[in-house]
Amino acid sequence: QSPIFGPQDVSSIEGNSVSITCYYPDTSVNRHTRKYWCRQGANGYCATLISSNGYLSKEYSGRASLINFPENSTFVINIAHLTQEDTGSYKCGLGTTNRGLFFDVSLEVSQVPEFPNDTHVYTKDIGRTVTIECRFKEGNAHSKKSLCKKRGEACEVVIDSTEYVDPSYKDRAILFMKGTSRDIFYVNISHLIPSDAGLYVCQAGEGPSADKNNADLQVLEPEPELLYKDLRSSVTFECDLGREVANDAKYLCRKNKETCDVIINTLGKRDPAFEGRILLTPRDDNGRFSVLITGLRKEDAGHYQCGAHSSGLPQEGWPVQAWQLFVNEESTIPNSRSVVKGVTGGSVAIVCPYNPKESSSLKYWCHWEADENGRCPVLVGTQALVQEGYEGRLALFDQPGSGAYTVILNQLTTQDSGFYWCLTDGDSRWRTTIELQVAEATKKPDLEVTPQNATAVIGETFTISCHYPCKFYSQEKYWCKWSNDGCHILPSHDEGARQSSVSCDQSSQIVSMTLNPVKKEDEGWYWCGVKEGQVYGETTAIYVAVEERTRGSPHINPTDANARAKDAPEEEAMESSVREDENKANLDPRLFADEREIQNAGDQAQENRASGNAGSAGGQSGSSK
């Protein structure tokens, strides 16, 4: 008795697909050993057709796959485009040879069934409408017309021209004639259900002179499309139910014990388990729609069905499309934090993984909104302007080659709480969902900027200081100037942090930025932040207003300002005499109606270097640490 288990008999028809699941005992060896599918020959030899080692025979090329699901202790063999030649005896098994543990499977592929010449075959999907055509001779033009369904030897009337309708076909069957046609009548049966399948006889007239036609109705249950997705990746269910239900409410449901539980519908219903990670998008006016689910979990695996009905709920006799979703736990997508916590006034740095093979792809960050079908408007992207309401407090830092980019949001409010998606224009599987939870702050922020009312005067020297706690002692401190295409790091002159970390003085840890001389274009948002390598940490923002010098206002000598910087031993002075052509992205409104020019983070740092180090403490050249 084999410990491997599977279907002993599999039967299908030509052109179909099969998906054969083989179950194996849950042991570490079994999970990792070779899985195979072979065909038993008359000589007792079992020829491998496909294996988990990557082998694929010529006859299976382009139509078969073998997928291992170690977490379920199963593997699945999918074979498409079946022909009668596929009929035979097979083994699914485990082991380095085809003589290891196995299970015998018999596959039988039949021809599409044929019927006698006078039988018309109608093949329809569940929920659709069939129109049965019934021909008759002129002699029966005024006779009674009817359609009956064969049940054993009897034929039970479904509908007739005297307006009788069988109760189980009520509101579903109509008998009619088209135009001036004198030799055909038609019967429409709508909202087809599986039990409608069978042999029908339509009849015009009575007795031996009656005209009869046979019709075989096949009602097909939806064959689930098999979807194999990695843990933490995303899946899109593309649903095309046809024009006849274009105006009905649409839904996606997941088959469960009792029913099919609606996950989302166009009437605003949404399963809380999918909050923040689902979008329903109408595709066109013909009723096509798609449902995207991100951040796939192990428990998302199962049978899904999309459909349409005015109630937004599954209804027998309405068209459906089906899928079986498998979620593979051996995922290439790294595990990232699903919940990020922040406090009001503070900041968060969110790391977004993307496919490292697609470092040049465009990166985006969007805010998932719960309204009706869910939507995710882009807030920032490598070629998307920062959305209104996020100016000065949101930036995206790409880190080419690292397989991740960072999104920083500061000046947090409780309204920022919610779900956000990281996405790229490349591999659509790499969409990650983050829930941001913003709580009321209970203490002062870690980074504080002085002065808090920052107004600089053109032509003068202006210094802002950023106070940081000792816990950031060893981290790199930076100032950057925020613009619509990121926050460009400003040059830093390392003048402080000379004392040992043991004797760190909490009150005197400062990193300063000096604008010398102030220009009109220096106006804007500036960020003070900390980072370690490519890992960004806390940030704080300040808006620097720039105004003309008014008569009588004191003129500060630049050297005096820098002398003050020199007097503070723990201070890190940053200085910027940034020229307009270096600090502004070249935007041509004709070229970029809704986009912007972009350099990567490395280029930004280079481009925004201050021109020289005039007036820097001790005349040293600056170095970023």
């Epitope: 279907p7 008999d9 039967s11 014990k257 029913t259 049978h303």
Partner: nanobody, 126 residues
């Protein structure tokens, strides 16, 4: 809800045959697989056979103890599943339960099934 009604049980001699039927009614369009389990007095409910389907493709699973003797089939139009039992043995004596599932991860596991019939007694005398 799906209702299941079994019929066809009875008393037979060893070596004889018997055909059980299980008629499903209600929301049958949600079902994905139907099968048979049996329970002998003082024993656990055990898997006998299951048929699952996907469109016009059928998958039949059997317990080792009934392989080659029992055959499961279904009539889609009648929403009925049949169990043809040949070469019956006294060991086959049990109450036979019909079960239906909407989602089936492992057909051998009773908890995977959502709906159950009341059961029909099969007694095989020697």
């Amino acid at each position: 809800q799906v209702q299941l009604v079994e019929s066809g049980g009875g008393l037979v001699q060893a070596g004889d045959s018997l055909r059980l039927s299980c008629a499903a009614s209600g929301r049958t369009f949600t079902t994905y697989g139907m099968g048979w389990f049996r329970q002998a007095p003082g024993k656990e409910r055990e898997f006998v056979t299951t048929i699952t389907w996907s469109g016009s493709t059928n998958y039949k699973y059997y317990a080792d103890s009934v392989k080659g003797r029992f055959t499961i089939s279904r009539d889609n139009a009648k929403n009925t599943v049949y169990l043809q039992m040949n070469s019956l043995k006294p060991d086959d004596t049990a109450v036979y339960y019909c079960a239906a599932s909407t989602v089936l991860r492992d057909p051998r596991v009773p908890t995977e099934y959502d709906y159950w019939g009341q059961g029909t007694q099969v007694t095989v005398s020697s």
